[in-house]
């Protein structure tokens, strides 16, 4: 791998203007390795992942290496540096800890094999933010209709542990989805900035599944959903006094 030649080649094409990484999974039509996802859970670290189908039957492919460069000053650093950590984020990945991560500069990454570039992407960390799932989901009963057929509940949760919400480093918006257990389609509620929301008019004799996911406000993508919260509403006959719920 010739660092200076590769640097000259990519710098001449203004790497920061290359296509940004699509945080979602990409289909890999060619046999060459490709970046599948770069993700930052909390704006302080990030990792990038790639496919490795090539090692199943393609000839003469050397080890896959990831190199990165950041625009730290005046021009792109004149060297491509190799991935600082191939282990922490799992197989076919590179992990950048907080020392390597700043939201205030663009990054370019490339995959190489046998000294040749097989894929390259540029991005800013904020574009690849996908928070960890919200945690500690629970619910409380708000009230029950006079007929005893419908009930309203309040669902609460907590932000992911690694999201620095208190200092405002991350501002998360949440999306709650719910459905009856035997249904396939989830009902989506409008995104909110709070960590609790009322869900109205649930059928008392049904069991519901509730899940929540979050994204950084104004940038990034939704992260994975929380674990499912199961909501079973007791039958009206189990309530001692209807007035208690008004």
């Amino acid at each position: 791998f010739s660092g200076s030649e590769a640097t000259a080649a990519i710098l001449s094409r203004a790497p920061w203007s290359l296509q940004s990484v699509n945080p979602g999974l990409k289909t890999n039509s060619s046999k060459e390795p490709k970046f599948t996802k770069c993700r930052s859970p909390e704006r302080e670290t990030f990792s990038c992942h790639w496919t490795d189908e090539v090692h199943h039957g393609t000839k003469n492919l050397g080890p896959i290496q990831l190199f990165y460069t950041r625009r730290n000053t005046q021009e792109w650093t004149q060297e491509w540096k190799e991935c600082p950590d191939y282990v922490s984020a799992g197989e076919n990945s590179c992990y950048f800890n907080s020392s390597f991560t700043s939201i205030w500069i663009p990054y370019c990454i490339k995959l190489t094999s046998n000294g040749g570039t097989v894929d390259e992407k540029c991005f800013s960390v904020d574009e690849i933010v996908q928070p960890d799932p919200p945690i500690a989901l629970n619910w409380t009963l708000l009230n029950v209709s006079l007929t005893g057929i419908h009930a309203d509940i309040q669902v609460r949760w907590e932000a992911p542990r690694n999201a620095d919400i208190q200092k405002g480093w991350m501002v998360l918006e949440y999306e709650l989805q719910y459905k009856e257990v035997n249904e396939t389609k989830w009902k989506m509620m409008d995104p909110i900035l709070t960590t609790s929301v009322p869900v109205y008019s649930l059928k008392v004799d049904k069991e519901y599944e509730v899940r929540v996911r979050s994204k950084q406000r104004n940038s990034g993508n939704y992260g994975e959903f929380s674990e499912v919260l199961y909501v079973t509403l007791p039958q009206m006959s189990q309530f001692t006094c209807e007035e208690d719920f008004y």
């Epitope: 203004a14 920061w16 203007s17 290359l18 296509q19 940004s20 302080e44 950041r70 625009r71 730290n72 000053t73 005046q74 907080s98 020392s99 390597f100 991560t101 700043s102 205030w104 500069i105 663009p106 540029c122 991005f123 800013s124 904020d126 574009e127 480093w169 104004n218 940038s219």
Partner: antibody
Framework: EVQLVESGGGLVKPGGSLRLSCAAS????????MDWVRQAPGKGLEWVAE??????????YYAESVKGRFTISRDDSKNTLYLQMNSLKTEDTAVYYC??????WGQGTLVTVSS | EIVLTQSPGTLSLSPGERATLSCTAT???????LHWYQQKPGQAPRLLIY???NLASGIPDRFSGSGSGTDFTLTISRLEPEDFAVYYC?????????FGGGTKVEIK
């Protein structure tokens, strides 16, 4: 050679508005992340706002002290950066510098907010 | 936000002397994201050192930078008449970008 030339500064009353411009040349403006940094008379430097390139969806960032009052924007076809300043306060009085990645700086334009 | 405190506020030295300027951060800053600027009266700041220890283009090698974590230092080995100016440290690691309050290096 990178050149950044600010204009639009002047005297304005508290509560008033002003729009600063920065004409850029010597680099590919459309690819660049641009910032405004200000310096109150006799004081230190304070970062104000940043706007990123089209490839980065022209994402914008602001200092808490100006959020909701200032708007950073750009016109890539004119190689020009802007800072729209509304609801100006006396504490906004400063020299405003246009910067390329906070590496290259213009000479600045003075904004004075006074009644 | 990360607050950068520079000391001393003013440094009175003679040409030829060594100047040592300090910048302390309220929380850890990666060395990659700590820069130093020089500003002369009536002029815009000029990038002096980037990523803690790298000289920006056209900067003489009497300037050097060091440090890690929360403590960073700018050293001018032998002051030249043109070095008398205000120096600012700057970080853009975790919080919004911030600058130190500046150290004025004046002629004794």
């Amino acid at each position: 050679e990178v050149q950044l030339v600010e204009s639009g500064g002047g005297l304005v009353k508290p509560g008033g508005s002003l729009r600063l411009s920065c004409a850029a040349s010597g680099f590919t403006f459309s690819d660049a992340w641009m910032d405004w940094v200000r310096q109150a008379p006799g004081k230190g430097l304070e970062w104000v706002a940043e706007i990123r390139s089209k490839a980065n969806n022209h994402a914008t960032y602001y200092a808490e002290s100006v959020k909701g009052r200032f708007t950073i924007s750009r016109d890539d076809s004119k190689n020009t950066l802007y800072l729209q300043m509304n609801s100006l306060k006396t504490e906004d009085t400063a020299v405003y510098y246009c910067t390329l990645y906070r590496d290259y700086w213009g000479q600045g334009t003075l904004v004075t907010v006074s009644s | 936000e990360i607050v950068l405190t520079q000391s001393p506020g003013t440094l009175s030295l003679s040409p030829g002397e060594r100047a040592t300027l300090s910048c302390t951060a309220t929380s850890s800053v990666s060395s990659s994201y700590l820069h130093w600027y020089q500003q002369k009266p009536g002029q815009a700041p000029r990038l002096l050192i980037y990523s803690t220890s790298n000289l920006a283009s056209g900067i003489p090698d009497r300037f050097s930078g060091s440090g890690s974590g929360t403590d960073f230092t700018l050293t001018i080995s032998r002051l030249e008449p043109e070095d008398f100016a205000v120096y600012y440290c700057h970080q853009y690691h975790r919080s919004t970008p911030t600058f130190g309050g500046g150290t004025k290096v004046e002629i004794k």
